[in-house]
């Protein structure tokens, strides 16, 4: 959580002289309360935007927009404090809009925007716009908060950002997993254009359970340049455990830009469908399609093998 580095932070607009300042997140109007304070923002809109830094990196930023209520309290509005809280780490970043001239009513509703909070993929933020001065103790609150979940690196707009590309977001392994006979899985995926090793992590689970019944790790050495973008095929042997039938295959790359913290891709093979209460099949019921014009029943042995084959 940081501010976009190189931009001159501007909040002036026609009819208002305004400057953006860094804030400690504790505006001094809390310490010296005023008698008359403005009302809260009318609406806050938040969406994700992508901006470039002065080093040419593409970073995800929050675009925050809010409007003022059309009441007389705008005469007492001296500015606004924008606060962004990252939920999981309690990190908070604030800026202050300082109005250098008085607001006046005009034909359009006053609208403000700010697009300089740099955020992380797959993180949740609480955005608060606090009108200044803040209210006296027990006064009506004059802030509004909205939460915003930044998409992860799978999201199309996020994929091209520098933090996501650094963690390998552009690599699409297109994993296929095929169940073979004799308790084996065939895993196939597309290698990336870097000479780095991969790990395949196989975790098997019983049907409808989350406790693993088998785990296996398979190391794939770094490919040669002529193998880049080619398919890699690996056959994994499963543990012969009845009911250990749901398999999650995860591929972990070790790209130089993210080392052991690269984005993983996974695929899952579900347990074969089993009827809840299979009805017993009477001996005389043919389990094959008779050839046209023929009603011959095969002998018992044949019926048995057809039956067996049918269930496979």
């Amino acid at each position: 959580l940081r501010l976009l580095d190189h931009r001159a932070l501007v909040c002036s607009q026609p009819g208002l002289n305004c400057t953006v300042k860094n804030s400690t997140c504790l505006d001094d109007s809390w310490i010296h309360p005023r008698n008359l304070t403005p009302s809260s923002p009318k609406n806050i809109y938040i969406n994700l935007s992508v901006s470039s830094t002065q080093h040419g990196e593409l970073v995800p930023v929050l675009h925050v927009e809010w409007t003022l209520q059309t009441d007389a309290s705008i005469l007492y509005l001296e500015g606004a404090e924008l606060s962004v809280l990252q939920l999981n780490t309690n990190e908070r970043l604030c800026v202050r809009f300082e109005f250098l001239s008085k607001l006046r009513h005009h034909h359009r509703r006053w609208r403000f925007t700010f697009s300089h909070f740099v955020v992380d993929p797959d993180q949740e933020y609480e955005v608060t716009v606090h009108h200044l001065p803040k209210p006296i103790p027990d006064g009506d609150p004059n802030h509004q908060s909205k939460n915003f979940l930044v998409p992860d690196c799978e999201h199309a707009r996020m994929k091209v950002t520098t933090p996501c590309m650094s963690s390998g977001s552009l690599w699409d392994p297109n994993i296929t997993v095929e169940t073979l006979e004799a308790h084996q899985l065939r895993v196939s995926f597309t290698l990336w254009n870097e000479s780095t090793h991969y790990q395949i992590l196989l975790t098997s689970f019983p049907h409808m359970e989350n406790h693993s019944c088998f785990e296996h790790m398979h190391h794939i050495p770094a490919p040669r340049p002529e193998e880049f973008h080619q398919r890699s095929n690996v056959t994994l042997t499963l543990r012969n455990l009845k009911g250990c039938c749901r398999h999650q295959v995860q591929i972990q790359p070790f790209f130089s830009s993210c080392l052991n913290d690269c984005l993983r891709h996974s695929a899952t093979v579900s347990c074969p469908e089993m009827p809840d209460t299979p009805e017993p099949i009477p001996d005389y019921m043919p389990l094959w399609e008779p050839r046209s014009g023929s009603s011959d029943y095969k002998d018992d042995d044949d019926k048995g093998s057809s039956h067996h084959h049918h269930h496979h």
Partner: antibody
């Protein structure tokens, strides 16, 4: 001194309700997200719920979703956990905990004990 | 949801021994991992956050490492006061799950 003090624990029958409180002091309560974490007798820690500083983000563990409600009153520096439809497996010591800037939870209360038993 | 596992579930070591506890996330969590120490009858205390940053006031014999899915808590020289249960916790996204814990005692 930074302090969290839980209260409101006690014994209740299955299906009953309790409301836990956590009184915060020594820091700017309104600037922090707050958590409830519990620990069943002889078991490990289980994260229960989190509420952001201005209550706009709330999350629950699957095990309590739909039964527990987290809330806060910043003016009173207080955090609450309303627990309804209590079950035997909700028996635990309940802690409120403040997340540290940078991650983890660096301030914990002493805990309050909830016993659900018929 | 991401699962957290810890190993071993318990261990006994001598005073002065180097002790290592591992924590594994079922999916990558970057360095959003914390370690706690809980002594019997007490509330948990934060030892390490951001996978490797030592919380202030925690003795330097404790250290953390790892990123992505595999993390380690190391006590370089076990002391009698380190007898406790140690928990890892992920905090990249809710639910902020804890590991099942590792109980450490003295031989």
């Amino acid at each position: 001194e930074v302090q969290l003090v839980e209260s409101g624990g006690g014994s209740v029958q299955p299906g009953g309700s309790l409301r836990l409180s956590c009184a915060a002091s020594g820091f700017t309560f309104s600037s922090y997200s707050m958590n409830w974490v519990r620990q069943a007798p002889g078991k490990g820690l289980e994260w229960v719920s989190i509420i952001s500083s201005r209550s706009s983000i709330i999350h629950y563990a699957d095990s309590v979703k739909g039964r527990f409600t987290i809330s806060r009153d910043n003016a009173k520096n207080s955090l609450y956990l309303q627990m309804n439809s209590l079950r035997d497996e909700d028996t635990a010591v309940y802690y409120c905990a403040r997340p540290k800037v940078g991650g983890g939870m660096d301030v914990w209360g002493q805990g309050t004990t909830v016993t659900v038993s018929s | 949801d991401i699962q957290m596992t810890q190993s071993p579930s318990s261990l006994s070591a001598s005073v002065g021994d180097r002790v290592t506890i591992t924590c594994r996330a079922s999916q990558g969590i970057s360095n959003y991992l914390a370690w706690y120490q809980q002594k019997p009858g007490k509330f948990p205390e934060l030892l390490i956050y951001a996978a490797s940053t030592l919380q202030s006031g925690v003795p330097s014999r404790f250290s953390g490492s790892g990123s992505g899915t595999d993390f380690t808590l190391t006590i370089s020289s076990l002391q009698p006061e380190d007898v406790a249960t140690y928990y890892c916790q992920k905090y990249n996204r809710a639910p902020f799950t804890f590991g099942p814990g590792t109980k450490v005692d003295i031989k």
